[in-house]
Each structure stands twice: as structure tokens, then as C-alpha cells.
Amino acid sequence: APVPPGEDSKDVAAPHRQPLTSSERIDKQIRYILDGISALRKETCNKSNMCESSKEALAENNLNLPKMAEKDGCFQSGFNEETCLVKIITGLLEFEVYLEYLQNRFESSEEQARAVQMSTKVLIQFLQKKAKNLDAITTPDPTTNASLLTKLQAQNQWLQDMTTHLILRSFKEFLQSSLRALRQM
């Protein structure tokens, strides 16, 4: 697994460097998670042909993965810092069950999958400190999550491979949109 942000050799070599601001720390954290997703996608794509699957086949999957929409205030038109931050945190909380599903889906990248999951938890904490309106953030229901996890794990092999691919792809896109918006804040 890659070294968590703030622990690479560059940081050790420059002990007198200014500490990271909260925005820089969040930026670095998201890039770290994106690196992890890249590694996981590599294993997924090497193992199956899901990455070449047509969009039609992907669309048939009824996963309810978080996605940025215009109303979320994270795009330039209608950009709203607080609404967007709430959407990012809510979306990340909703992704947690899917990241849990990924935990037993990798052979050579088991550690990497764990790192992505744990780093996402840390990212959520960073973002919650930044948010003013924590009341607007809805936490997913644990019972609903548990039954969703059971349902996903009961799928046949092909659907499990497809689900893994979709989760990684959607999570990557969600993080990219989130970081682009956070860079405006």
C-alpha cells in the first residue's frame, strides 16, 4: 500500500516546511485515495474484461451509487460552498458500505483496499471539521447498509466483478468532482 499522506520521504527530508493547511491536507488525502483506487482498478481490469464493458451493460446494474448533480452546488453553475460540502460528506458516508464490500474482493491488493477504506474515514473527519452545517448531513441507516451488503455478496461471480468495477469507477469520479469543487472553496 502507498504511504499515507504526510509520511513520505519528502516530508521527512524537509522538517522545517510549513505545516499543511486544512485545505492542503484534504487535497493530499483525496489524491492519496485516488492513487489507491488506480491500483485497485488495475487489478480489476487485469482480472476481468469489465473495464471494456459497454456503457449499456453498466447502466443495467441497479446500484444506487452517489453521484454529483447540478443541484448539489458542486459545479460552476449554481456553485454553493455549504450545499456542496454537505453533498460531498453525505456521498462519502454513502460510499462506505460499498468500500466495505470491496474488502474481500482483491487478492494482491488486499492492503490497498483497506487503505482506501481507512483513508476515506479520515477524509470524512477532515471534511466534517470544515463543514458549518453538520445537521444537514444524513448518515446512512446501518440496518439498510447491512442488508445491502448481504445482497451484494450474494450475487453471482460476474455481477460481483461488475459491482466491484462500478464502485471503483463511481468512487473515482465522485472524488474527482469533489476535489475540483473543494479547490474553489
Partner: nanobody, 124 residues
Framework: QVQLQESGGGLVQAGGSLRLSCTVS????????MGWFRQAPGKEREFVAD????????WYADSVKGRFTISRDNAKNVMYLQMNSLKPEDTAVYYC?????????????????WGQGTQVTVSS
Amino acid sequence: QVQLQESGGGLVQAGGSLRLSCTVSGRTFSTYAMGWFRQAPGKEREFVADINWNSDNIWYADSVKGRFTISRDNAKNVMYLQMNSLKPEDTAVYYCAADSYGVGGGKEEYYDSWGQGTQVTVSS
């Protein structure tokens, strides 16, 4: 990293149009976020616009909003900047940039590959 090459710059009268192209070498073009920056004589390089991998997240600097349009063709490995209603203050060297994380943003530090630039001169 990828190689970037801008083209399409030139001399144009105020109110005219130009289309800049940025050709990218490398198979991973479609995963990159791409941006346009510009640098006027004696000024800092500034953000113009950026576009994500599938063109559904586009940002513009306030100074060009409504006049410039950024787009990309992933099949051809090219990004474009359509510039309409050009003003003398748009005179600058225009650079294209690529972000391998697929994010982009308004600061130079967010991009890891840069082109050499193409000159755009708008005369009054």
C-alpha cells in the same frame, strides 16, 4: 506524463474569433483533466478554463465566461478553446495543461504536464 502541443494562435482584430487546439500524445488522454492558462506580458500566468475527462464538469475564469468555450475530443486526443468576442486584454501566450489525477483547478500546481504555449494577439 504526456506531451502537449498548442496550435491555432495568431493575430486577430477585437471582436474576432480564434480556436486554439491542444494535441496530446499518450494513450491515457481520456483520463486526464485538461486546462487552459494564459500569460500576458509582464503578468503572472492565469487560469482560463478547465474540463474533466468526460466534459461534464467545466469551469471558466470570470473574465472569459460567456465568450470562451472549452471542449475536448477523447477519440482524437485533442482539447480546444473556442474564443469569441476577443478583446485586446485577451492578448497573451496561451498554454494547455494536463492533470493526471483527472481533477484540474485554477492553480498551476494542480497540473503535471504543460505545453510550450501559442501566442494570441488581439489588436484594437
